[in-house]
Interface confidence: low
């Protein structure tokens, strides 16, 4: 009956911890005889190929100093410790503490035996380390030009991390790799970059971070700070006011960010009827007259710029009885 | 032992707003994005959408709109916003761990009819 | 959208191996889990991340993947294995986040 070496093909370790290589013989043959079981890189120098042995009365051996005994441990092979004992060496599961970079690459275990001589299997082991993930918006000021809006930055990953981002703006994502202060490491940071405008300010978007090491991807929201000159619109008219009417304002209506320091009111014209009050963001009128047949101006300013808005008022002689709202406000 | 649990499923008439709330055992809500899906009568399994860690909502293109997620420390809630007769359904709230599903809990029956 | 296609019904004699496939019409970066229905019950995950068998699971159920069809393989299939089965998959694109269910395949065993 054939025997084999049942490996995994890969197996993962963290960065710093300890991981387990399982090796076994298999099936279990009465009366075969297992001489060795031994633990190889096959890609290493020569001299550091034979990482660990183990012999069925003498017991484990490491050879190599990397990674060195301190650092290696069988699981669960046992030797013979007299005439009544037999030696296990079916399981040559191998373990490896406090693992570094340099750890990663092809382990074979072997073994010889009789009479079917030596049968061995491969396992790759690959080092990983969890990267630590953070995101924050950067405060940007309004232009026509592409701008870093938020950054997402996940660091000392093994391998890199995958960032990608989850919004409905209009977006690209620029991204750089530098090594991280833990040898083997990357630190990804992608830059979530569009032309900012008042239309992003407080938008949540979401940093979404994929890594080996996460049971599930990471996501991370972040709200956007965008400071904009004021958006201005003015509401309160109603294609209604007539000469003499006394319950008519005008409001000028404001996004901006930060907010406004100041409201202006004017009218294109120049003249500015004696009856129109401007109170803050508010142009309330005690009575009309035909001095507002006229296009009355809101300018807001802010720490950012300036925006205004402009309404065109039409004076009636008389009320407009025709399905007019009541809307002057 | 981890369990999740659905509740406020009922009759209700179209355009009567339902909520559903999902209740956790043996582990925190808090710590888990949480999912809904839903089973109508002899389909199979549709998910709505799903609430993260951070307490953003991401919903299935058909199913903006018409539902909200939200949760607090201890529940997760569905909302649907004006139930139609095609919304009949078993509603299902899971743990989303990993690249799937990996904690259900029993289902609630959701009946919409005039 | 994306979709994932399924077998409506699949036929498998007890004792016998069958392979169950989820074909999505894109390719997806994204990886493929498995869910066991049985009438009046939840799902329960059986497969994630194409390969990955949850603790409690019998190693009778095993995924695969290549191309855009992950396959569930139940070995060995038992009585007990009557069910639905969905296989779903993230949709993640660059402005949107959602799963996707495929349409399940109600698998009877004979004999």
């Known amino acids: 009956q054939d025997v084999r070496v049942q490996v995994l093909p890969e197996v993962r370790g963290q960065l710093g911890g300890t991981v387990e290589l399982p090796c076994h013989l298999l099936p279990p043959v009465p009366g075969l005889y297992i001489s060795l079981v031994t633990w190889q890189r096959p890609d290493a120098p020569a001299n550091h190929q034979n990482v660990a042995a183990f012999h069925p009365k003498m017991g484990p051996s490491f050879p190599s100093p990397k990674p060195g005994s301190e650092r290696l441990s069988f699981v669960s092979a046992k030797q013979s410790t007299g005439q009544d004992t037999e030696a296990e060496l079916q399981d040559a599961t191998l373990a490896l503490h406090g693992l570094t970079v340099e750890d990663e690459g092809n382990y074979t275990c072997e073994f010889a035996t009789f009479p079917k001589g030596s049968v061995r299997g491969m396992t790759w082991l690959r080092v990983i380390a969890k990267p630590k993930n953070q995101a924050e918006a950067q405060k940007v000021t309004f232009s026509q030009d592409p701008t870093t809006v938020a950054l997402c930055i996940s660091k000392e990953g093994r391998p890199p991390a995958r960032i990608s981002w989850l919004s409905s703006l209009d977006w690209e994502a620029k991204e750089t790799q530098v090594s991280g202060t833990l040898a083997g490491t990357v630190t990804v940071t992608s830059r979530f970059t569009l032309v900012p405008s008042g239309r992003a300010d407080g938008v949540t978007v979401t940093c979404k971070v994929e890594h080996e090491s996460f049971e599930e991807p990471a996501l991370i929201p972040v709200t956007l700070s965008v400071r904009y000159p004021p958006e201005v619109s003015i509401s309160g008219y109603d294609d209604n006011w007539y000469l003499g009417r006394t319950d008519a304002t005008l409001s000028c209506d404001v996004r901006s960010n930060p907010e406004p320091t100041g409201y202006d009111w004017s009218t294109t014209s120049g003249t500015f009827p004696t009856s129109a009050v401007a109170q803050g963001s508010q142009l309330v009128i005690h009575a009309v007259d035909s001095l507002f047949n006229t296009t009355f101006v809101c300018t807001v300013t802010n720490a950012v710029g300036m925006g205004r808005a402009e309404q065109v008022i039409f004076v009636r002689e008389t009320p407009n009885t025709a399905g007019a709202g009541a809307t002057g406000g | 032992q981890e369990q999740l649990e659905e509740s406020g499923g009922r009759l209700v008439t179209p355009g009567t707003p339902l909520t559903l709330t999902c209740t956790a055992s043996?582990?925190?809500?808090?710590?888990?994005?949480m999912s809904w899906v839903r089973q109508a009568p002899g389909k199979g399994l549709e998910w709505i959408g799903l609430i993260n860690t951070g307490d953003s909502a991401y919903y299935a293109s058909w199913a903006k709109g018409r539902f909200t997620i939200s949760r607090t420390s201890t529940t997760v809630d569905l909302r649907i916003t004006s139930p139609t007769t095609e919304d009949t359904a078993t509603y299902f709230c899971?743990?989303?761990f990993g690249d799937g599903f990996n904690l259900w809990g029993p289902g609630t029956l959701v009946t919409i009819s005039s | 959208s994306f979709v994932l296609t399924q077998p409506a019904s699949v036929q498998v004699d007890l004792g016998q191996t069958v392979s169950l496939t989820c074909t999505a019409d894109?390719?997806?970066?994204?990886?493929a889990s498995w869910y066991q229905q049985k009438p009046g019950q939840a799902p329960v995950l059986l497969i994630y991340r194409d390969t990955s068998r949850p603790s409690g699971v019998p190693d009778r159920f095993s995924g695969s993947s290549s191309g855009n069809t992950a396959t569930l393989t139940i070995s060995g299939a038992q009585a007990g294995d009557e069910a639905d089965y969905y296989c779903?998959?993230?949709?993640?694109?660059?402005?949107?986040?959602?799963?996707?269910f495929g349409g399940g395949t109600q698998l009877t065993v004979t004999g």
């Open positions: 899971a743990r989303t």
């Open positions: 894109t390719l997806s970066r994204s990886y």
């Open positions: 043996g582990f925190s809500l808090s710590s888990y994005h």
């Open positions: 779903a998959t993230e949709d993640s694109g660059d402005s949107s986040y959602q799963y996707v």
